[in-house]
């Protein structure tokens, strides 16, 4: 049903869905702090631009009785229940921030006439791609796929002289929400990644993964998995690994690799870690003080969602345009705005662009070093270390198919 938006006459409200089921197990209080910090900045910017308006957030909590798994599995209905709550209260803001679960975002987008923008910290899955009024502020699966295809095809770097066309993907079903959808995208037979590879097999059992490490008949030397170093260790332990195996560990929302005192454990020597370029300061704001690196990215996405709304509100008000229009709802894309931690770029479909970083373990220093970076905005790879001290023979990445190239 049509719900009137509290979004005019100098008063602009943001509806923040505080869902029990979330992409990251983050205390809702921390998300509230992030939102409130964002509101302070937005109010300052609007006031200084001579726009005497009120901007507030309404936090919409679900009852938590029905939807209490805490993860995203039961989120589909929770999102719709919250929308129903908004509808019953006849109180919808100019913009909806949340949900973070792919299931709930997809269902809410499907089941509502969205004449307002929706900003998500999450919604990683391919099913949330190309949604006209949805903006995603954490790297979605599509961005990961494009990097992997780009990297697989690269063959003109000193450390990578072979194009790859094969891969194993390890996916055992216990992954975190981001990893679940990243691997889901790689597994999907209709996805860009599957389309571009000649061979791809999903390993679902620990034993399958462990066997491949020394299997002379393996069909690929490359294994993609998602998680942190500890996750890899639990699976791999100290098992011997064939010297031409390359494990790609996707661990986007983890700054720990860049900390000064971090030493790479020995089991990481065959591993390339894909992560995001870190924020380069230890933020001392109220919302980030007690956060782990992963959770900081999640809370930061909420804060940046507020700043994005403020950015768009300022533009529309300065141009004398109406906020409760389809034009406003469709405007949250193809732009760069000043986020809390620096510039945030959104692509044509409202998905955040970022710099991905591929790290390797230096055999000399036992430190993580940057091998290359990848700008998702221009789909371009930039080599950083032209003479990496790899574990692989001749300091070059092996061919992806055993029996060809350096072994």
């Amino acid at each position: 049903s049509q719900v009137s938006q509290n979004c005019h006459n100098g008063s602009y409200e943001i509806s923040v869905l505080m869902m029990g089921n979330s992409a990251f197990a983050e205390p809702l209080k921390n998300l509230e702090d992030a939102v409130n910090e964002g509101l302070e900045i937005v109010r300052g910017r609007l006031q200084n631009a001579g726009l005497n308006v009120t901007v507030n957030a309404t936090f919409m909590y679900s009852d938590g009785l029905i939807h209490n798994s805490g993860d995203c599995r039961s989120s589909t209905c929770e999102g719709l229940d919250l929308l129903r709550k908004i509808s019953n209260a006849q109180r919808m803001g100019c913009v909806l921030i949340g949900p973070s679960c792919t299931y709930s975002t997809f269902q809410m987008y499907l089941d509502t006439e969205l004449s307002y923008p929706m900003i998500s910290a999450g919604s990683f899955g391919l099913s949330c791609d190309y949604k006209e009024t949805l903006t995603r502020l954490m790297s979605p699966a599509r961005k990961l796929m494009y990097f992997l295809v780009n990297f697989w095809k690269t063959n003109d770097l000193p450390f990578k002289t072979y194009s790859w066309s094969t891969s194993y993907v390890y996916k055992n079903g216990t992954e975190t929400e981001d990893c679940f959808w990243y691997l889901n995208a790689l597994e999907a037979s209709v996805s860009y990644f599957s389309h571009e590879l000649g061979f791809k097999v999903v390993l679902r059992q620990d034993k399958e993964f462990q066997d491949i490490l020394m299997d002379h008949n393996r069909k690929s030397n490359v294994i993609i998995m998602c998680g942190g170093p500890e996750f890899l260790y639990k699976l791999k332990g100290d098992r011997a690994v064939a010297e031409d195996i390359v494990i790609i560990l996707v661990d986007l929302f983890n700054d720990q690799y860049f900390e000064d005192n971090v030493t790479a454990p020995d089991y990481m020597k065959n591993v390339l870690v894909l992560t995001l370029s870190p924020g380069n300061s230890l933020l001392n704001s109220s919302f980030s003080r007690n956060l782990s690196p992963t959770k900081r990215d999640f809370a930061l996405a909420y804060l940046n969602g507020i700043l994005l709304f403020g950015h768009m509100l300022k533009i529309f008000l300065e141009n004398g345009e109406n906020i409760t229009t389809p034009k406003f709802a469709h405007a949250f894309r193809n732009l760069t705005f000043e986020g809390y931690d620096g510039p945030v770029t959104l692509d044509d479909w409202g998905d955040v662009d970022s710099t991905m970083v591929l790290l390797y373990t230096s055999v000399d220093t036992k430190k993580y070093k940057v091998l290359l970076t990848y700008d998702t905005h221009v789909n371009k790879t930039y080599p950083v270390d032209m003479s990496p001290t790899f574990t692989w023979k001749n300091s070059k990445l092996p061919n992806d198919i055993t029996g060809r190239g350096p072994q």
Epitope: G44, N48, G279, N280, N284, T336, E338, Y340, P343, V378
Partner: antibody, heavy 118, light 110 residues
């Protein structure tokens, strides 16, 4: 009214240090990114550094590792600590407010002159 | 990050139009719609004229306009006036948190 006032410039020997300050007034300082931009005598503008509202900092390659930008929100003041100064750092240093739209600096100070010479 | 390329100087008579170009690459001007233009009179601080390629801050006369095509941005000053004689700088967001300036163009009003 909205204003930025730089101070702390002067003559310093190569290898020496200097700390520039920029006092802001007339706006909510903490809501904005703040930048340092410099201009060598008779030359063009060169972006030096930025600090965002969240405290994240970035630098031009030419000053990375030698200069440190910081802010004190309750004092409405921006700083630039310059160490290991070189002759090529000689310039007028401007502090500039980010307009909330990237690389648009809508408010500039009058500049403070730094001369590095033996 | 190398700078953007501007012509060192240009000139025009009062009432005429002049256009100053600013050429970058597909990683800066071509990749983002964030080109700014600044005017600087001798001994003064720069002043923002244009931001986000085409937008004018309040108080800037509509004689100043910006545009972009591919890797090149342009500033057009129409109805040239004596007080327009100054140095003009372009700048572009270049990804990450970097931005680059052009070398500057001296505009002389004949």
């Amino acid at each position: 009214q909205v204003q930025l006032v730089e101070s702390g410039g002067g003559l310093v020997k190569p290898g020496g240090s200097l700390r520039l300050s920029c006092a802001a007034s007339g706006f909510t300082f903490s809501s904005y990114s703040m930048n340092w931009v410099r201009q060598a005598p008779g030359k063009g503008l060169e972006w030096v550094s930025v600090i965002y509202s969240g405290g994240s900092t970035h630098y031009a390659d030419s000053v990375k590792g030698r200069f440190t930008i910081s802010r004190h929100n309750s004092k409405n003041t921006l700083y630039l600590q310059m160490n290991s100064l070189r002759a090529e750092d000689t310039a007028v240093y401007y502090c500039a407010r980010g307009a909330g739209t990237l690389n648009a600096f809508d408010i500039w100070g009058q500049g403070t002159t730094v001369t590095v010479s033996s | 990050q190398s700078g953007l390329t501007q012509p060192p100087s240009t000139s025009g008579s009062p009432g005429q139009s002049v256009t100053i170009s600013c050429t970058g690459t597909s990683s800066d001007v071509g990749a983002y719609s964030y080109v700014s233009w600044y005017q600087q009179h001798p001994g003064k601080a720069p002043k923002l004229l244009i931001y986000a390629v085409t937008k004018r801050p309040s108080g800037v006369p509509d004689r100043f306009s910006g545009s972009k095509s591919g890797n090149t941005a342009s500033l057009t000053v129409s109805g040239l006036q004596d007080e327009d004689e100054a140095d003009y700088y372009c700048s572009s967001f270049a990804g990450g948190s970097t931005l680059v300036f052009g070398g500057g163009t001296k505009l002389t009003v004949l």
